[in-house]
């Protein structure tokens, strides 16, 4: 058992059918040393009576807030909340796998640029009683500080007969150099709390790998004389990190018709302009890379041929 | 300890060309070893991220932009001296401090240099010949070297008595693998940065 | 005590379909994960799927992904398997097992797939 | 096709010391904790040791598991006729879970 914040403990269960489940000592917070009586939860039945309660913690049921009581007044309140270590491995019931990159990736994270600055999201179909709390740190041995905000519902999506929520997370590193060569990665840690049920989720990163720009800016298109060919232009997203000669970007620019099946043609090119044809009723996406660290492409930036 | 904006003409600067080489041929390698080395802790995830040239050199640090040295967190105070005669200077208003900058660089390339090619020696003489360095990232380093052209003390090549452990050794090859792409990296956005200003 | 015994095994043609269940005393069913495995004659032990004690997800083996469903009724205490375009391969013992560290295991049935 | 890989077949005398392997991966054995099975003709699998070492009430003392980075082996000491059975070793794979990984099985002889 340990103590998650005031009066809030997590007791760790080896979850199996006929599992014995761990004894708990409870101890009254009080100078009171004899009347006081013990109740769980809105239940009025007394659970025993002394200055501690010993109880066998086996299943949900065993949860909840325990209260000791004197003489009709309440001395003091101890919530206890279940860990499930189902087959040695923490339960993750609470949060969606998201399978991207990965499997097994609950908790998904991206930078806009090399700021320290980054927002992390994950998604559960659970929509009441759900509590989460961020911690993050540069390494985890002689941690260096992160700053992360409160965790947010930014989203709500339909998925087939579900709903699914998509909470997300701002984080920041306290001391961070934009042209620093990273050698120990973030660490962030999730807590979550669905009713009487605790998980802690975990990821770990480099800014480097989760890099992915804003799109192209102003993108814009100038006829050539003459010609079917126009000249694309665009600039660096307002977020990217500056100067933008070392922090490098490369494009991809992309003639796209209006019929998904039609082949695309695409350039790449390290400029922020291209020459490109332009065919009727298409369109043209210009998407941004760093340069010199192959992280993810941003979002296509777009505008029509005509 | 940061790059002036009054420098080298554009399109003057002939590093920039052989740094692009380097980056890619290291991240050619890396792959490479990663595709070999399957069954080895060789991913990013799973090795410990060392920097050989930790507390030799300052290259972050002496390659700053002009524009982040008003970020403190970018200003360490990590000193190194260095011999100050480039090559790749195109010009000759170059300031103390970008010379400082491309003798770092000089100096993290032949530390990476002696350290791969003790590495390729041992690799060499493992039974399995799973993996060798790859000749053409190794001539890069050299190429780029002499465009740098700064006169700096030959190091031995570190040479050993006792047998190879050869796991040891490929382990070692993908930690210094990926600390070698992460400075390529550094050095790649030095040489555009220079190149533009 | 904790009891799972299985159900509905027998022989089949191939194409057809076949479901199993799986019913289970002794246990809060509703709180436990649960597997089936099986095993074929002579061969060893292969994973066949997986339902979360809620239901809410599902794993399957590739060898049986897109033609087994697993299902649970946590107000009938029983798990179920319905097989669907049942080939040769498929002929085995078929276990249900509840997750955990401390596992345990039904009698398993048979299941024959033969034309 | 399993990736836990177990010898075929072992054998010894009755009160002799057998031992079984499980060779795995990072991804797997390295990563998560083994189970052992007893298997006896036409019967269902028994657990004989969780979280790698540790035995069920009930399993005797010959029986001993351990784990050593991507392998996993199971040792009975001072054989006995009835230990003649099929053996398991389970466990799961960090990208798969929670699908069981079993060993490919071994066939335990007690020789007369």
């Known amino acids: 058992i340990w103590e998650l914040k005031k009066d809030v403990y997590v007791v760790e269960l080896d979850w199996y059918p006929d599992a014995p489940g761990e004894m708990v000592v409870l101890t009254c917070d009080t100078p009171e040393e004899d009347g006081i009586t013990w109740t769980l939860d809105q239940s009025s039945e007394v659970l025993g009576s002394g200055k501690t309660l010993t109880i066998q913690v086996k299943e949900f049921g065993d949860a909840g807030q325990y209260t000791c009581h004197k003489g009709g007044e309440v001395l003091s309140h101890s919530l206890l909340l279940l860990h499930k270590k189902e087959d040695g491995i923490w339960s993750t019931d609470i949060l969606k796998d998201q399978k991207e990159p990965k499997n097994k990736t609950f908790l998904r994270c991206e930078a806009k640029n090399y700021s320290g600055r980054f927002t992390c999201w994950w998604l559960t179909t659970i929509s009441t009683d759900l509590t989460f709390s961020v911690k993050s740190s540069r390494g985890s041995s002689d941690p260096q500080g992160v700053t992360c905000g409160a965790a947010t519902l930014s989203a709500e999506r339909v998925r087939g007969d579900n709903k699914e929520y998509e909470y997300s997370v701002e984080c920041q590193e306290d001391s961070a150099c934009p042209a620093a060569e990273e050698s120990l990665p973030i660490e962030v840690m999730v807590d979550a709390v669905h009713k009487l049920k605790y998980e802690n989720y975990t990821s770990s990163f480099f800014i480097r790998d989760i890099i992915k720009p804003d799109p192209p800016k102003n993108l814009q298109l100038k006829p050539l004389k003459n010609s079917r060919q126009v000249e694309v232009s665009w600039e660096y997203p307002d977020t990217w990190s500056t100067p933008h000669s070392y922090f490098s970007l490369t494009f991809c620019v992309q003639v796209q018709g209006k019929s998904k099946r039609e082949k695309k043609d695409r350039v790449f090119t390290d400029k922020t302009s291209a020459t490109v044809i332009c065919r009727k009723n298409a369109s043209i996406s210009v998407r941004a890379q760093d340069r010199y660290y192959s992280s993810s492409w941003s979002e296509w930036a777009s505008v029509p041929c005509s | 300890r940061n790059l002036p904006v009054a420098t080298p003409d554009p399109g003057m600067f002939p590093c920039l060309h052989h740094s692009q080489n380097l980056l890619r041929a290291v991240s050619n390698m890396l792959q490479k070893a990663r595709q070999t080395l399957e069954f080895y802790p060789c991913t990013s995830e799973e090795i410990d991220h060392e920097d050989i040239t930790k507390d030799k050199t300052s290259t972050v640090e002496a390659c700053l932009p002009l524009e982040l040295t008003k970020n403190e967190s970018c200003l360490n105070s990590r000193e190194t001296s260095f011999i100050t005669n480039g090559s790749c200077l195109a010009s000759r208003k170059t300031s103390f401090m970008m010379a400082l900058c491309l003798s770092s660089i000089y100096e993290d390339l032949k530390m990476y240099q002696v350290e791969f090619k003790t590495m390729n020696a041992k690799l060499l003489m493992d039974p399995k010949r799973q993996i060798f360095l790859d000749q053409n990232m190794l001539a890069v380093i050299d190429e780029l070297m002499q465009a740098l052209n700064f006169n700096s003390e030959t190091v031995p090549q570190k040479s050993s008595l006792e047998e190879p452990d050869f796991y040891k050794t490929k382990i070692k090859l993908c930690i210094l693998l990926h600390a070698f792409r992460i400075r390529a990296v550094t050095i790649d956005r030095v040489m555009s940065y220079l190149n533009a200003s | 005590q904790v009891q799972l015994v299985e159900s509905g095994g027998g022989v089949v043609q191939p194409g057809r379909s076949l479901r199993l269940s799986c019913a289970a005393s002794?246990?809060?069913?509703?709180?436990?994960?649960m597997h089936w495995v099986r095993q074929a004659p002579g061969k060893g032990l292969e994973w066949v799927a997986f339902?979360?004690?809620?239901?809410?997800?599902?794993y399957y083996a590739d060898s049986v992904k897109g033609r087994f469903t697993i299902s649970r009724d946590n107000s009938k205490n029983t798990l179920y398997l319905q097989m669907n375009s049942l080939r040769a391969e498929d002929t085995a013992v078929y276990y249900c097992?509840?997750?955990?560290?401390?596992?345990?295991w039904g009698q398993g049935t048979m299941v024959t797939v033969s034309s | 096709q399993s990736v836990l890989t177990q010898p075929p077949s072992v054998s010894g005398a009755p009160g002799q010391r057998v031992t079984i392997s499980c060779s795995g991966s990072?991804?797997?054995?390295?990563?998560?904790?083994v189970k052992w099975y007893q298997q006896l003709p036409g019967t269902a699998p028994k657990l004989l040791i969780y979280?790698?070492?540790q035995r069920p009430s009930g399993v005797p003392d010959r029986f001993s598991g351990s784990k050593s980075g991507t392998s996993a082996s199971l040792a009975i000491t001072g054989l006995q006729a009835e230990d003649e059975a099929d053996y398991y070793c389970?466990?799961?794979?960090?990208?798969?879970?929670?699908?069981?990984?079993f060993g490919t099985g071994t066939k335990v002889t007690v020789l007369a």
């Open positions: 097992k509840t997750h955990g560290s401390h596992d345990n």
């Open positions: 002794g246990v809060t069913f509703s709180s436990y994960g």
């Open positions: 339902i979360r004690y809620d239901g809410s997800n599902k």
């Open positions: 990072r991804s797997n054995i390295g990563s998560n904790t």
């Open positions: 979280y790698n070492d």
């Open positions: 389970q466990s799961y794979d960090r990208y798969t879970h929670p699908a069981l990984l």
